[in-house]
Amino acid sequence: SIPWNLERITPPRYRADEYQPPDGGSLVEVYLLDTSIQSDHREIEGRVMVTDFENVPEEDGTRFHRQASKCDSHGTHLAGVVSGRDAGVAKGASMRSLRVLNCQGKGTVSGTLIGLEFIRKSQLVQPVGPLVVLLPLAGGYSRVLNAACQRLARAGVVLVTAAGNFRDDACLYSPASAPEVITVGATNAQDQPVTLGTLGTNFGRCVDLFAPGEDIIGASSYCSTCFVSQSGTSQAAAHVAGIAAMMLSAEPELTLAELRQRLIHFSAKDVINEAWFPEDQRVLTPNLVAALPPSTHGAGWQLFCRTVWSAHSGPTRMATAVARCAPDEELLSCSSFSRSGKRRGERMEAQGGKLVCRAHNAFGGEGVYAIARCCLLPQANCSVHTAPPAEASMGTRVHCHQQGHVLTGCSSHWEVEDLGTHKPPVLRPRGQPNQCVGHREASIHASCCHAPGLECKVKEHGIPAPQEQVTVACEEGWTLTGCSALPGTSHVLGAYAVDNTCVVRSRDVSTTGSTSEGAVTAVAICCRSRHLAQASQELQ
Amino acid sequence: QEDEDGDYEELVLALRSEEDGLAEAPEHGTTATFHRCAKDPWRLPGTYVVVLKEETHLSQSERTARRLQAQAARRGYLTKILHVFHGLLPGFLVKMSGDLLELALKLPHVDYIEEDSSVFAQ
C-alpha cells in the first residue's frame, strides 16, 4: 500500500494501490536550498542536478566528523519527497540543488540570499518554464531575507518554505513570515499538528496551510537504495512544493496568487485538532491540509477567495492593524476582531494605489486584528463607497450606485469609544442587496465591484442572544466575499471568514453575565462569476 | 578567498578615490535603520548585509562598498567586502567591526543594514 502521506494528499478518484496522479510536474523545475545531497540515490538519480553553488558556514564542534552520509541526509530526503521515483509527490519534476546548509544543518541568512540571487540570475540567463523554490529552513525574523523572497516571487517564482519546528508563531521566523512565500506547517497521519519533542510545528497567521510532516518515508543518504523516515516542517513544505509543481505543470500560466488560492481551495478543511495550538493562535491558524486537485483542469470557473489576518495592533488607544491582499488579488471585504470586544470597527482605504483593510482599537482594548477577504477576480473594478455618520435617527446607509456594480462587503467604523452602549452598528444589506446600513454614529463602507458576470447575494443567520458564535455559510458554487455582524444588544467581538463560512463572535456571556435580549446575526455576502464558469466550459 | 595583499590594495584605491572627491554626498531626510536577529544565539555579529535603495545600480553598490572601506580604513579598521548583490536586492555583504555601523548607516543610498544570522534545517 502507498505511504500514508501520499495517500493523504491524493484525491479519492486517484486512490488506488499505487500513487500515480496525472502529470508528474514534468514542465516545472524545483530548486532546493538545503544541505548537500546524494545525487546518485536510486530515488532521485537523473532527476536532480547538483549546481556548483555552495555557501555554508563552518561546522561547530570540538571533534567534528564529516561523513558524507550525514552531510547529505536532510537534502537527499527532501529531494526524494518532492520528486522521488517511488516515494515522491511529483515524480516528473526536475530539481536543482544549492548547498546553503552545512553538515549540521546550519546556514546563514547571507548564504541563503546569495543562493536566491543565484536562482534569479540563472532564470534571467536561461529562462525555463515555471520555477518552484523550496526553502526547508528557518531562522529568526529577517527583513532582508523576506525582501529577497518578495523580489523573487514578483519575478514569477513560486517559493515554498517550512513554517519552522519551534512550536511558536511562524511570523517570528524567516522566510516563513514573508507574505509572498507559501508557508507550510506539519501534520501527522491523524491530521494532528506534529510534535517534535518539546517543540513541534509552528502555527499562526503566517502559515498558509499544513501538509504531511511526520514519519515521512524518503531517500536515505546512508546508501543509494536506502530509505528512512524523517519528520518536520521541511517534509511538509516538500509535499507542497511537489503539489505546486504538478499544478504548474498542468497549468503553466498560473500566477503565484492563483496557485496559492488553488492550494487553499483544494486542501482538506477543518480536519486539524486546533486544541494543540495556543488558544490565542487558533483563530489565526488555517485549518487546512494540502491535497492535489481532483482534476488538473476545470478549477478556473471558481471564484477563489482567502482570508488574510493582520498582525495584532497592540493595545494603545489609537492602535490600528492593517491586512493586505497580494498584488494580483482584490480586497472584496474587510472585517475586524478583538478578543476584548473593545474596537472601533474597520474600514477599507487606499494605500499605494491598492485597497487595504484597517481595523481600529478602542480605549481599554487589548488590541484588534484586521481581516481581509482577498479574491481572484479578473478584470475587476472595485471601489469603496463611504457614508459618514448620519444625523438622522434612522442610521447611516450606503449603496453601490454605479451601473453593474455589486456589493461584495460592508464595513463599519466609529469614533465613539463604545458604540455598544449606544446601540451596536448595524450592517443590513438584506432586502436591498446593494446597500449597507449602519448605526448613525458610525461611518459605513461598502465594497462595490464590477466584473464580467459577477453576481452576489446576501445570506443571514440570526440566533437569540446570548450567543458566543453564530455562523452562516455560502452554498455550493458560491464563494464567501463578505462577512459582518448584525448584533442585537449583546457585544460583538468581530466577524471573520473561515473558508466559505462567515463567523460572528460575541462576548463570552459567562464572563460578562449579560443576558441581553435581541439576536446575534451573521451576514454573509456570497458571490459567483458566471463569466469564469463560461470561460472554463469553453476551455473543455 | 582573496589574500590580505589584495584587500590592502583595494583599501588604498578606495582611499584615493575618496580624496579625489568621487564619492557622492549622503541624501538628506532619510535615516537608514539597523536590524538584527531577535534571538541572540542565532546572531552572527561581524558580518552585515548592507541593503541599498531599490533603484541603486551595481556600479553605485560597488562605489558605496569602496567608500565604506575607505572611511573604515581612515579610522584604522579593516573591512572585507564578501559579496556585492545585484539581481534581487542592491547591496553588499561586508565583514567589519560593529563599531562601524553608525558610519555605514550614513552612507549614500543605504536603505537598511542587517546583521547576518543563522538559519537551520527544519
Partner: antibody
Framework: QVQLVQSGAEVKKPGSSVKVSCKAS????????MHWVRQAPGQGLEWMGL????????YYADSAKGRFTISRDNSKNTLYLQMNSLRSDDTAVYYC???????????????WGQGTTVTVSS | QSALTQPPSVSGSPGQSVTISCTGT????????VSWYQQLPGTAPKLMIY???KRPSGVPDRFSGSKSGNTASLTISGLQTGDEADYYC???????????FGTGTRVTVLG
C-alpha cells in the same frame, strides 16, 4: 511515554573504567542530540558533554576531556558514557538528557534519565 | 567550567511570589538561550523554562522567565508547597563551547 532508562549503579576502584548506558523509548532517538550531566553528592549539576543526533559533532566539559567519551548506537536507541581513569571525585549520579533541538537550535534538556550512581572508592 | 551565579536560597509563603536570579556573562546568558530546571528531592531535574521565557506543555503558567543583559530570572507566583525544590538555570557558553549550569537555588515554602 517518552523516557530515558539508564543502566544500574556501579562501584569502581580509582584508575578503573566504566561504561554507563541510556536507552531511549517512545521518540525518534536519531533526531535528537544527547547530553550527559552529573551531580556529586550534595552538589549542583555539572555538564559533562553533548553528542549530535547523528554522532557528527561532540562537545566535552574540561573535566571530561581526554578521560570521558560519549557515543551512541542509533540502531539500538542507546547513548553511552565511557569513563576511564576514574578518580574519587568522579563519584556522582550521572544523568543522560535529551537536547530539545532536533538539529541545532536549542541545547536545553527536556527529557532526563533517572540517573546512574557511580561510586569511585578504594 | 565556571558556573552561573544564583542565590543559595529564597523563601516565601504560600500564594506569594519569589524570584530567582541567575548571573552570567556575554558569552552565556548575554547572548545565549537560558533554561530553568526544577529538581525535587531525590529525583532527576525537570525542564521548566526554555528560550528565556517559554514553558514546555504541562508546566504551570505560575512559572515565568525573563532576561535582561547578562542576568536571567525565574519567577514563581502563587507559591505552593509542591514548588519546594532546587532550581538551576542553564545556558550554552560560546567561549567554552559547552553548557553551564547555575550554582542552584533552594526554594523553601514557609509555614
Amino acid at each position: 511515554q517518552v523516557q530515558l532508562v539508564q543502566s544500574g549503579a556501579e562501584v569502581k576502584k580509582p584508575g578503573s573504567s566504566v561504561k554507563v548506558s541510556c536507552k531511549a523509548s517512545a521518540f525518534t532517538f536519531d533526531s535528537f542530540g544527547m547530553h550527559w550531566v552529573r551531580q556529586a553528592p550534595g552538589q549542583g549539576l555539572e555538564w559533562m558533554g553533548l553528542l549530535w543526533s547523528d554522532g557528527s559533532g561532540e562537545y566535552y566539559a574540561d573535566s571530561a576531556k581526554g578521560r570521558f567519551t560519549i557515543s551512541r548506537d542509533n540502531s539500538k536507541n542507546t547513548l553511552y558514557l565511557q569513563m576511564n581513569s576514574l578518580r574519587s571525585d568522579d563519584t556522582a549520579v550521572y544523568y543522560c538528557a535529551r537536547a530539545m533541538g532536533a538539529i541545532y537550535y536549542y541545547y536545553a534538556m527536556d527529557v532526563w534519565g533517572q540517573g546512574t550512581t557511580v561510586t569511585v572508592s578504594s | 567550567q565556571s558556573a552561573l551565579t544564583q542565590p543559595p536560597s529564597v523563601s516565601g509563603s504560600p500564594g506569594q511570589s519569589v524570584t530567582i536570579s541567575c548571573t552570567g556573562t556575554s558569552s552565556n546568558i548575554g547572548n545565549q538561550f537560558v533554561s530553568w530546571y526544577q529538581q525535587l528531592p531525590g529525583t532527576a531535574p525537570k525542564l521548566m523554562i526554555y528560550e528565556y521565557n517559554k514553558r514546555p506543555s504541562g508546566v504551570p503558567d505560575r512559572f515565568s522567565g525573563s532576561k535582561s543583559g547578562n542576568t536571567a530570572s525565574l519567577t514563581i507566583s502563587g507559591l505552593q508547597t509542591g514548588d519546594e525544590a532546587d532550581y538551576y538555570c542553564g545556558s550554552w557558553d560560546s567561549s567554552l563551547s559547552g553548557y553551564v549550569f547555575g550554582t542552584g537555588t533552594r526554594v523553601t515554602v514557609l509555614g
